[in-house]
Amino acid sequence: EEELQMIQPEKLLLVTVGKTATLHCTVTSLLPVGPVLWFRGVGPGRELIYNQKEGHFPRVTTVSDLTKRNNMDFSIRISSITPADVGTYYCVKFRKGSPENVEFKSGPGTEMALGAKPSAPVVLGPAARTTPEHTVSFTCESHGFSPRDITLKWFKNGNELSDFQTNVDPTGQSVAYSIRSTARVVLDPWDVRSQVICEVAHVTLQGDPLRGTANLSEAIRVPPTLEVTQQPMRVGNQVNVTCQVRKFYPQSLQLTWSENGNVCQRETASTLTENKDGTYNWTSWFLVNISDQRDDVVLTCQVKHDGQLAVSKRLALEVTVHQKDQSSDATP
């Protein structure tokens, strides 16, 4: 005759408030004859959770049909879980006896604890933009989870980061916890299209972690490079000078032309193009009138990018005699 074993497979059961908890219990033998009852806690003050034969347990239902002849499954479901339901639950086999049934064997118990899912992680970047090669900090916060154990990872474009510091509060017992992590990220020039991801894994998420993201485009400033060139061909009595502003981000840019130190107000033609890496190029054309009186023209292209100090590039205009002749020839 096989000795009766009471099997409660889960040591810990995490449940959410308002949901239904399933407590598993199976027996390995039908003998001795007698009922299986569920209790919370141990000792004389233990609380009766379910007795199939008598009492009133409106929140409890059985998983299988306890009335079936050879039933060995005494699992129960408890509905509408509240914080008052936490504790350790035992299924206990009794042997029929007189005057009272006698406790025969208890299962090892299943601890029911309240699990609360973490909130969606919120990732915040730096307040001000920073240029490539510098380090910026991102913070990730998630709240309201329980139990305290939680895993947080950082990624940049799918690559896991290692330079971060994480705190879970409070350190003592609590109904819910919060996590805050700060990651240090070195900016690369091509990071306009990059993303940092904060990933939170918790037992209540059943292997489906929550993610919060931040775009590095919010944190990076790629300063432009400037090049001013004179086009070899002239148009009538005008020479075309080009200012190429390359590889900058964000798009916010002011460009002004100066002729021998005097800011030119007249309209200039320009084009804006976006590069594959998310940076921009800006090209501005400036037409300079060529005349005999103007031997040394210095043109300056000045760029103010994203509220930073202006940068400029100068070009001393080369007007050859041949060009002047052509110019005068062209003038009617």
Partner: antibody, heavy 113, light 108 residues
Framework: EVQLQQSGAELVKPGASVKLSCTAS????????MHWVKQRTEQGLEWIGR????????KYAPKFQGKATITADTSSNTAYLQLSSLTSEDTAVYYC??????WGQGTLVTVSA | QIVLTQSPAIMSASPGEKVTLTCSAS???????LYWYQQKPGSSPKLWIY???NLASGVPARFSGSGSGTSYSLTISSMEAEDAASYFC?????????FGGGTKLEIK
């Protein structure tokens, strides 16, 4: 819906016996303990005993040992209370209940010569 | 056997008044096994409070139950006319199961 239908009122002579019935609907009696409770006019409730209809096991309050016999017939889904050697002290309303939660409407037993 | 003593045996209360009925056990009763029943004249008892403090279905929220060990109580926060009835405490912690003598609650 759980219902317990008890047999009608009984007028019996002292020394006689009476058998009361309690027929259940909405559940199988073999799945629950069936209890019997006595209530004398304008008085409290007294637990007589109970039966486990699944195997016929019974428990009685010492006061009712020898006075009351509880039986059950699972085929008709009915529990019974037999009272013997009746005296005027046995004049009361007798209730059956399912597992302490659902009660029948009661049966009045009057013992009178 | 466990003897349950209810007090008072009879009491009357005015509408809106707070009412407390007590049930004292001769030896300790686990709170899971202490029930209260309400009974009105000509009707069978109705399960009113189970496991010391849980209200049965349909019982108004003005009712509450508490206690442990040998001392239990049923409280009505604000008496209403429909609460006039007899209330019995009941233990099924050990055989023989026993009932208290009851408290007859009347409305003034």
């Amino acid at each position: 819906e759980v219902q317990l239908q008890q047999s009608g009122a009984e007028l019996v002579k002292p020394g006689a016996s009476v058998k009361l019935s309690c027929t259940a609907s909405g559940f199988n009696i073999k799945d629950y303990y069936m209890h019997w409770v006595k209530q004398r006019t304008e008085q409290g409730l007294e637990w007589i005993g109970r039966i486990d209809p699944e195997d016929g096991e019974t428990k009685y309050a010492p006061k009712f040992q020898g006075k009351a016999t509880i039986t059950a017939d699972t085929s008709s889904n009915t529990a019974y209370l037999q009272l013997s050697s009746l005296t005027s002290e046995d004049t009361a309303v007798y209730y059956c209940d399912r597992g302490l939660a659902y009660w029948g409407q009661g049966t009045l037993v009057t013992v009178s010569a | 056997q466990i003897v349950l003593t209810q007090s008072p045996a009879i009491m009357s209360a005015s509408p809106g008044e707070k009412v407390t009925l007590t049930c004292s056990a001769s030896s300790s009763v686990s709170s899971s096994y202490l029930y209260w029943y309400q009974q009105k004249p000509g009707s069978s008892p109705k399960l009113w409070i189970y496991s010391t403090s849980n209200l049965a279905s349909g019982v108004p929220a003005r009712f509450s139950g508490s206690g442990s060990g040998t001392s239990y109580s049923l409280t009505i926060s604000s008496m209403e006319a429909e609460d006039a009835a007899s209330y019995f405490c009941h233990q099924w912690s050990s055989y023989p199961y026993t009932f208290g003598g009851g408290t007859k609650l009347e409305i003034k």
